[in-house]
């Protein structure tokens, strides 16, 4: 058993049918010694008397808010949450496995640049009685500071019969140098509580591996005289790290017909312009990627050929 | 990525082309190592990230773009002095800091070159003959060092009398390749920045 926050305790349990459970001793936070009784949640049934209460915690029915009283007055509370260990693995019932890039990916994180700012998000099918708290650091043995905001509900989607809820959080490394070579990963820890169930999720990454630039901006077409060709030009996204000559991007230019089945013409370039043939009803799209470290491509920025 | 490769202009900053080749070569070598050593801890998540140049060179600090020198998090008090007469500096007026930067890059390359050659000698003794260092990568390191053209003491190749532990050598190869790839990215960024300056 350990304290999650004031008066909230997590009981770690080997979780299988008929498991023996854990013996927990609760102590009433009071100078009083006599006449103390204990109750659980809203029930008025007295579970025991005395300054301490010993309980065998085996299932969710044994968790909840234990209260000690004296003569009708509440003395203190202890909220017991359960953390299930199924066959030696901590349970992951609250969050949905996003399975990208691999199984057991519950947290996904992205950064738009090398400033040390990043966003993480996760999914759940649970809509009520749910709280999250997020902590982060650079490294774990001698952790350096990363400040995270509060997790917020960022999207709701309908998936088949189920509603899916996306939560996200923004974090900022306290003293980040965009040019630094990372040797210690960023660690992100999310505590999730649903009713009386506690779970924790972690992710470990280097900012360089979660970079996903914003799409190129100001995408423009300039027809070339007496030709079906057009000059496509664009600019680096505002959110990308500067100077651009140091934090360079590479670009992929794609000409896509109206039908998805039509052949796509693709050109790769390090410049911020390219000459392509514009077909009728086609569209031109450009996306960006760090020129030197192949993390994710940005989403496409698109303009119609007409 | 199989992208069309731009040929450098004759008047281009001479080291840019070599640094691009370096990054391509180390990335290919790392990919080959990951595939060949699939049952070894060789991914970024599995290895310890060690920098063999730590406390010996200060490439990131010495090569910091001017725009980032205002960022206190980027300024490190480590000062290392280097020899300052490189041919990449030819045909341009360069500051002391730029010379320091390029000589720091040269020292990095020299240290990695020694480590890789020592490691390759061990890998050649492996009865499994599972993996060797790409000669192209070693040649590209050499070319960039020649282009930088710093006069520096030759570091003797380390020789070891004890029987090599091939498992450990292969794990060390992965660690070294990951670190060298990160440094090659920094070198490429620096060359691109200097070329635009």
């Amino acid at each position: 058993i350990w304290e999650l926050k004031k008066d909230v305790y997590v009981v770690e349990l080997d979780w299988y049918p008929d498991a023996p459970g854990e013996m927990v001793v609760l102590t009433c936070d009071t100078p009083e010694e006599d006449g103390i009784t204990w109750t659980l949640d809203q029930s008025s049934e007295v579970l025991g008397s005395g300054k301490t209460l010993t309980i065998q915690v085996k299932e969710f029915g044994d968790a909840g808010q234990y209260t000690c009283h004296k003569g009708g007055e509440v003395l203190s509370h202890s909220l017991l949450l359960l953390h299930k260990k199924e066959d030696g693995i901590w349970s992951t019932d609250i969050l949905k496995d996003q399975k990208e890039p691999k199984n057991k990916t519950f947290l996904r994180c992205e950064a738009k640049n090398y400033s040390g700012r990043f966003t993480c998000w996760w999914l759940t099918t649970i809509s009520t009685d749910l709280t999250f708290s997020v902590k982060s650091s650079r490294g774990s043995s001698d952790p350096q500071g990363v400040t995270c905001g509060a997790a917020t509900l960022s999207a709701e989607r309908v998936r088949g019969d189920n509603k899916e809820y996306e939560y996200s959080v923004e974090c900022q490394e306290d003293s980040a140098c965009p040019a630094a070579e990372e040797s210690l990963p960023i660690e992100v820890m999310v505590d999730a509580v649903h009713k009386l169930k506690y779970e924790n999720y972690t992710s470990s990454f280097f900012i360089r591996d979660i970079i996903k630039p914003d799409p190129p901006k100001n995408l423009q077409l300039k027809p070339l005289k007496n030709s079906r060709q057009v000059e496509v030009s664009w600019e680096y996204p505002d959110t990308w790290s500067t100077p651009h000559s140091y934090f360079s991007l590479t670009f992929c230019v794609q000409v896509q017909g109206k039908s998805k089945r039509e052949k796509k013409d693709r050109v790769f370039t390090d410049k911020t312009s390219a000459t392509v043939i514009c077909r009728k009803n086609a569209s031109i799209s450009v996306r960006a990627q760090d020129r030197y470290y192949s993390s994710s491509w940005s989403e496409w920025a698109s303009v119609p050929c007409s | 990525r199989n992208l069309p490769v731009a040929t450098p202009d004759p008047g281009m900053f001479p080291c840019l082309h070599h640094s691009q080749n370096l990054l391509r070569a180390v990335s290919n070598m790392l990919q080959k190592a990951r595939q060949t050593l699939e049952f070894y801890p060789c991914t970024s998540e599995e290895i310890d990230h060690e920098d063999i140049t730590k406390d010996k060179t200060s490439t990131v600090e010495a090569c910091l773009p001017l725009e980032l020198t205002k960022n206190e998090s980027c300024l490190n008090s480590r000062e290392t002095s280097f020899i300052t007469n490189g041919s990449c500096l030819a045909s341009r007026k360069t500051s002391f800091m730029m010379a320091l930067c390029l000589s720091s890059i040269y020292e990095d390359l020299k240290m990695y070159q020694v480590e890789f050659k020592t490691m390759n000698a061990k890998l050649l003794m492996d009865p499994k003959r599972q993996i060797f260092l790409d000669q192209n990568m070693l040649a590209v390191i050499d070319e960039l060092m020649q282009a930088l053209n710093f006069n520096s003491e030759t570091v003797p190749q380390k020789s070891s009398l004890e029987e090599p532990d091939f498992y450990k050598t292969k794990i060390k190869l992965c660690i070294l390749l990951h670190a060298f790839r990160i440094r090659a990215v920094t070198i490429d960024r620096v060359m691109s920045y200097l070329n635009a300056s």
Epitope: Y16, P17, E59, E86, I89, D93 | -
Partner: antibody, heavy 112, light 107 residues
Framework: EVQLVESGGGLVQPGGSLRLSCAAS????????MVWVRQAPGKGLEWVAS????????YYADTVKGRFTISRDNAKNTLYLQMNSLRAEDTAVYYC?????WGQGTLVTVSS | DIQMTQSPSSLSASVGDRVTITCKAS??????VAWYQQKPGKAPKGLIY???HRYSGVPSRFSGSGSGTDFTLTISSLQPEDFATYYC?????????FGGGTKVEIK
């Protein structure tokens, strides 16, 4: 007493479908993840699919992905395995399990 | 996929013998290994989880050890009711995979 009882097995033609059920009792079913494991005649054990307590996380073996669907009804204390496009190699005894307890198994025979 | 290689595939032993069965994972699985016992015509039953933890009600003569890639199930003093087939399983990553089984027969 913990009990897991499978039903729904039988003889089916290749390409056909079956729905297996597993009735759970003696424990709080809704608090536990569950799995289906199969055993071909005279062979070893093969994991088929897993489902978390609230159905939010589901995993399948590659051999059954796209053909089988694991689901549960916590109100009915029942685990299901919907099997479509059945093949001869799916012939096996199918067990539902929540360690350390396994059901007695139900035999599925796919044959023309 | 992670392969679990169990050995021996069968063994003959007498009541009172100490029996050791090994299981080798093709890659590191931490301690996420379970052991099962299956008697002819019956369903398997869990004995050990997390490589070395006995489920409640499992006799103390059964013990498990190991971590990483090498795991062992030991029966300290074989009893008549222990003649069965034993399987190891890794649950470190999907797909979950079982060893081929070890049949423990009466000598």
């Amino acid at each position: 007493e913990v009990q897991l009882v499978e039903s729904g097995g039988g003889l089916v033609q290749p390409g056909g479908s079956l729905r297996l059920s597993c009735a759970a009792s003696g424990f709080t079913f809704s608090d536990y993840g569950m799995v289906w494991v199969r055993q071909a005649p005279g062979k070893g054990l093969e994991w088929v699919a897993s489902i978390s307590s609230g159905s939010s996380n589901i995993y399948y073996a590659d051999t059954v992905k796209g053909r089988f669907t694991i689901s549960r009804d916590n109100a009915k204390n029942t685990l299901y395995l919907q099997m479509n496009s059945l093949r001869a190699e799916d012939t096996a005894v199918y067990y539902c399990a929540r360690n350390p307890y396994w059901g007695q198994g139900t035999l599925v025979t796919v044959s023309s | 996929d992670i392969q679990m290689t169990q050995s021996p595939s069968s063994l003959s032993a007498s009541v009172g013998d100490r029996v050791t069965i090994t299981c080798k994972a093709s890659q590191n699985v931490g301690t996420n290994v379970a052991w099962y016992q299956q008697k002819p015509g019956k369903a398997p039953k869990g004995l050990i989880y997390s490589a070395s933890h006995r489920y409640s009600g499992v006799p103390s003569r059964f013990s498990g050890s190991g971590s990483g890639t090498d795991f062992t199930l030991t029966i300290s003093s074989l009893q008549p009711e222990d003649f069965a087939t034993y399987y190891c399983q890794q649950y470190n990553s999907y797909p979950l995979t079982f060893g081929g089984g070890t049949k423990v027969e009466i000598k």
